[in-house]
């Protein structure tokens, strides 16, 4: 379960892929799309809140509750809209939500190199956010092999 | 209980090359980075880089990617930094540390090995 | 690099005292900011993490405050086992970067 129901902490960044790519975020017909973009150079960046939560880590082998905690985020682009992992479309929506948010739209955290960052899914261990045909997508991540897939890192910049 | 214990102090000859250990117990050791920092005697704490158990994957500072090489055996829960081309420099003790959070470094290192002794002396 | 500037480098205090470590990063570093104590002779010991939160099993007279670019570790009513240097640590972003470290000793 999450620590409480508030953040620790709260901080607007964008979002940009490994290759630098922009995600963007576009209002169509009443729904927003997510976009991964080149941007013109003299487009603003998107900006997305991301409100961190610390949460027990389940595969403790402890079980003492000291040991095993992670860092989980959600994502919110714009008021009210939260990031969603999809696991049944493999897909990462966005969708207008009320709090208490569900568990869709909590990741874990991960630090990579070059402060690179990885979001994993909450609901479905193993799977990342990522990119595919320039979208957002989820992905499988085998951990043995592909951690540092470039396709699921992530950089924020404030 | 987490723990992290080190192999022994090393004296070693300017120009060679030294391995250092760190076996992991009391947790799930594919799960949490392990990070390497250096202290020097009488001096303050650098943070050589990390590697995830679970994967191999590493990040290094870059002042250390030309002396350090960091590398697991999930098969025996140790982690190993190897030290190259030896010199007075680089005489310290060595810890090995676990993160706090799983695979997130923002909330430092919970738990540290004793620490080896690398001596450095011809 | 975010740079880590702690004061002051030493401190002597008597026993019973309130006393103050200031740390302040070169960048915003949000909360992520860590407080570890070494003893002489002995392994870095997380105090704080999180800015203020405390680590299991320290004593509740260790108080860490702050966020962004400016962070406090106060020791309330000085203890003699509390004799040690003390670091932050920026957990921000790579290289994680330590303060040059307050020594503590008694008067």
């Known amino acids: 379960s999450i620590t409480g129901i508030s953040p620790i902490t709260e901080s607007l960044a964008s979002l940009s892929t490994y290759n630098d790519q922009s995600i963007t975020f576009a209002l169509e017909d009443e729904s927003y799309e997510i976009y991964v973009e080149d941007l013109k150079k003299d487009k603003k960046k998107d900006k997305v809140l991301l409100s961190y939560y610390e949460s027990q880590h389940p595969s403790s082998e402890s079980g003492d509750g000291v040991d095993g905690k992670m860092l989980m985020v959600t994502l919110s682009p714009t008021k009210d809209f939260w990031l969603q992992a999809n696991n049944k479309e493999h897909s990462v929506e966005l969708h207008k939500c009320e709090k208490p948010l569900p568990d869709q739209a909590f990741f874990v955290l991960h630090n990579r190199s070059f402060n690179c960052v990885s979001f994993e899914c909450k609901t479905d261990p193993g799977v990342f956010i990522g990119v595919k045909d320039n979208h957002l997508a989820l992905i499988k991540v085998d951990y043995s092999e592909n951690l540092g897939s470039e396709n699921i890192l992530f950089k924020l910049s404030e | 209980q987490v723990q992290l214990q080190q192999s022994g102090n090393d004296l070693v000859k300017p120009g060679a090359s030294v391995k250092l250990s760190c076996k992991a117990s009391?947790?799930?050791?594919?799960?949490?980075?392990i990070n390497w920092i250096k202290q020097r005697p009488g001096q303050g704490l650098e943070w050589i880089g990390r590697?995830?158990?679970?994967?191999?994957?590493?990040s290094y500072n870059e002042l250390f990617k030309d002396k350090a090489t960091l590398t697991v055996d999930t098969s025996s829960s140790t982690a190993y930094i190897q030290l190259g081309s030896l010199s007075s420099e680089d005489s310290a003790v060595y810890f090995c540390?676990?993160?706090?959070?799983?695979?997130?470094?923002?909330?430092?290192?919970?738990?540290w090995g004793q620490g080896t002794l690398v001596t450095v002396s011809a | 690099d975010i740079q880590m500037n702690q004061s002051p480098s030493s401190l002597s205090a008597s026993l019973g005292d309130t006393i103050t470590i200031t740390c302040h990063a070169s960048q915003n570093i949000h909360v992520w900011l860590s407080w570890y104590q070494q003893k002489p002779g002995n392994i870095p010991k997380l105090l704080i993490y999180?800015?203020?939160t405390l680590h299991t099993g320290v004593p509740s007279r260790f108080n860490g405050s702050g966020s962004g670019t400016g962070f406090t570790l106060t020791i309330s009513s000085l203890q003699p086992e509390d004799i040690a240097t003390y670091y932050c640590?920026?957990?921000?972003?790579?290289?994680?970067?330590f303060g040059a470290g307050t020594k503590l000793e008694v008067k």
């Open positions: 640590q920026q957990g921000q972003s790579s290289p994680l970067t």
């Open positions: 540390a676990r993160e706090f959070y799983y695979g997130s470094f923002y909330g430092g290192f919970a738990y």
């Open positions: 009391g947790y799930t050791f594919t799960s949490y980075w």
């Open positions: 590697i995830a158990p679970g994967s191999g994957f590493i």
């Open positions: 999180k800015a203020s």
